[in-house]
Interface confidence: low
């Protein structure tokens, strides 16, 4: 599974990536008053999403950069060829202790699959904690818990999502590795669907406990950006989304699920070579605080206010967005202090705990993702062998409707 | 008709070698992959390779690895079982197997004998 | 590994009877889970692929449901010729395993 690292080229100095389009969908005064989304926000939000690129730090040593995206959940730094670090970020999987150790039997041998894992561990992804996550053939790691038609279009960690299709050689697998503090998955001696004689692909990506992800690369035969996106999207790095319900005009008890990005990080994906690694490090985020004096006074990048209803510190804008509006928490954060809710008893106020925003129809359609990548509509699918019940026994323990049926 | 049929079954003496054959008809064997399953005297059943439609990506289990060899010829529609360094544990019925819904044996040999013993 | 364990290892029943036999999984399978028939001196037979979706040719009398580490294969009424080894097999990661095998016989 792990070759011994080849000479890699020297990454050289002047050299970096770039963090796009970071703040998706949102303008400055909707992060600042987060209420409920009007239509003519909703119309806003589609066209908020080109981003921006972000300045670049250069480090002293010239070969790594370090970005910063603007909205501060992750410093992100890249590894050249050269730079030792990016051989100590790449998890040897052979070596590990066997019994923790997984050939994924159906993604090793499949073109354009998805298979749900769960991990050992509490994964905490721009501050939510995960249990479980969906691997795909074609490089990335699905993160959220509602399964959908567009697996790539966000909620994702993709150390090189592109069409790879492990089917195609006997020597492709796809490996994950879980210790209790770190869950590798290893896409190993893979093949892009149609570019077979570009040679195979071998890197990971690594979620460790504490929130750091690191994407290793140890060989990548082809300049990705020649890579094509005409079949498959291909993106390196992050984004996370929330989801709204809204209620359909055609049928009036039932709700729409709209997917909202509100935040993604690009890498550039000419620095993604062979042995070289990038490393995302978690900063601070407003749920972390657990209580209002902790929330008000932090001193991040967000906006964080306190909700009482829901004991929640939040900027409005995670993935529990939906309990946020429901709740009024943004009105009722509006000019308030910590002393304001000292006097109100909020465990009558408080919401069933059963209570889950993902409640109602899970028909989503293109029309209602608010996403860049609607031009590829990708038909991974979440399991290659789904019965009668399609998709029913993929979904979070606590989603409940109907699946969107991937087909298979 | 779908059919797979074993056979190179027989008695052989601990530490030599055996190679079991699998002959497929009625569907077209190079897009399958195919497995061997086996099943000691009033056992249960365990599983012992697999090898996928192309050849050469083959898995073991555990108590076989690099004892066994698992092969394939798609011009002949035959599946190989080579057994080297036999052990009076290996004694069981070898089944040949077609793997197929997300790996699951959908079709099954009739199965062939296998005795270790001195 | 993963294990498989199945229960009961055996169980007597009588004909028109409603028969569930589970099957644990040691770690999350998600729904690569099967279940196979087998009579005594015959290959075993594919039921059930993927937790809960029946195999072509076999009768509807049997049912399959779960996901994660809990399954169940159910008869809903018992034929004569159901008397049988039932097993199951993860087929989530290698190396392949199945369930020891529950015995259903005649009371």
């Known amino acids: 599974l792990s070759p011994q690292p080849g000479a890699g080229h020297d990454e050289g100095p002047g050299s970096g990536w770039a963090a796009k389009g970071t703040v998706r969908g949102w303008n400055r005064r909707a992060r600042e008053s987060p209420g409920h989304v009007s239509e003519p926000d909703r119309t806003q939000l589609s066209q908020d999403l080109g981003g921006g690129t972000l300045a670049m730090d250069t480090l002293p040593d010239n070969r790594t950069r370090v970005v910063e995206d603007n909205h501060s959940y992750y410093v992100s730094r890249l590894y050249g060829p050269s730079e030792p670090h990016s051989r100590e970020l790449w998890v040897d999987v052979a070596e590990a202790n066997r019994s923790q150790v997984k050939i994924h039997t159906i993604l090793s041998n499949t073109h354009r699959q998805a298979s749900r894992v769960v991990l050992s561990f509490d994964f905490p992804f721009y501050g939510h904690p995960l249990r479980q996550i969906t691997i795909a053939t074609g490089g990335f790691i699905f993160m959220g818990d509602v399964i959908h038609r567009m697996l790539t279009a966000t909620q994702y960690v993709a150390p090189l999502m592109a069409n790879f299709n492990p089917g195609y050689s006997d020597n492709s697998t796809v490996v994950y590795f879980d210790n209790g503090t770190v869950f590798v998955v290893q896409w190993d001696h893979v093949y892009l669907q149609g570019w077979e004689d570009k040679g195979s692909f071998t890197f990971q990506a690594a979620l460790h406990h504490d929130g750091r992800i690191v994407f290793a690369y140890k060989e990548i035969p082809m300049s990705v950006p020649e890579i094509s996106s005409s079949q498959h999207p291909v993106k390196t790095g992050l984004s996370d989304a929330f989801m709204i319900l809204n209620p359909s005009p055609d049928v009036p008890e039932s709700r729409r699920r709209s997917i909202f990005e509100y935040h993604r990080i690009e890498l550039d994906p000419s620095k993604v070579t062979s042995m070289s690694a990038v490393e995302f490090t978690p900063l601070p985020t407003c749920l972390q605080h657990r209580s209002c004096d902790a929330c008000m006074s932090s001193d991040l990048t967000f906006n964080c206010s306190w909700c009482h209803v829901l004991q929640r510190c939040s900027s409005g804008f995670d993935r529990y967005r939906q309990e946020w509006m429901d709740y009024g928490c943004a009105q009722e954060a509006e000019g308030r202090m910590c002393e304001d809710f000292q006097d109100e008893d909020h465990d009558s106020a408080s919401p069933d705990t059963s209570f889950s925003p993902y409640d109602g129809d899970l028909t989503t359609t293109s029309s209602s993702l608010f996403i860049d990548s609607l031009t590829t509509e990708d038909d991974t699918k979440l399991n290659p062998y789904a019965g009668g019940d399609g998709l029913q026994n993929n979904l979070s323990p606590k989603t409940k409707g109907t699946p969107v049926h991937l087909g298979t | 008709e779908v059919q797979l049929l074993e056979s190179g079954g027989g008695l052989v003496q601990p530490g030599g070698s055996l190679r079991l054959s699998c002959a497929a008809s009625g569907f077209t064997f190079s897009s399958y992959a195919m497995s061997w399953v086996r099943q000691a005297p009033g056992k249960g059943l365990e599983w012992v390779s697999a090898i996928y439609g192309a050849g050469g990506k083959t898995y073991y289990a555990d108590s076989v690895k690099g004892r066994f060899t698992i092969s394939r010829d798609n011009s002949k529609n035959t599946l190989y079982l080579q057994m080297n360094s036999l052990r009076a544990e290996d004694t069981a019925v070898y089944y040949c197997?077609?793997?197929?819904?997300?790996?699951?044996?959908?079709?099954w040999g009739q199965g062939t004998l296998v005795t270790v013993s001195s | 590994d993963i294990q498989m364990t199945q229960s009961p290892s055996s169980l007597s029943a009588s004909v028109g009877d409603r028969v569930t036999i589970t099957c644990r999984a040691s770690?999350?399978?998600?729904?690569?889970l099967n279940w196979y028939q087998q009579k005594p001196g015959k290959a075993p037979k594919l039921l059930i692929y993927?937790?809960?979706s029946l195999q072509s040719g076999v009768p509807s009398r049997f049912s399959g449901s779960g996901s994660g580490t809990d399954f169940t294969l159910t008869i809903s009424s018992l034929q004569p010729e159901d008397f049988a080894t039932y097993y199951c097999q993860q087929s989530y990661t290698y190396p392949l395993t199945f369930g020891q095998g529950t015995k259903v016989e005649i009371k």
């Open positions: 197997a077609r793997i197929s819904h997300g790996w699951g044996f959908d079709v």
């Open positions: 770690q999350d399978i998600s729904n690569y």
């Open positions: 993927a937790a809960s």
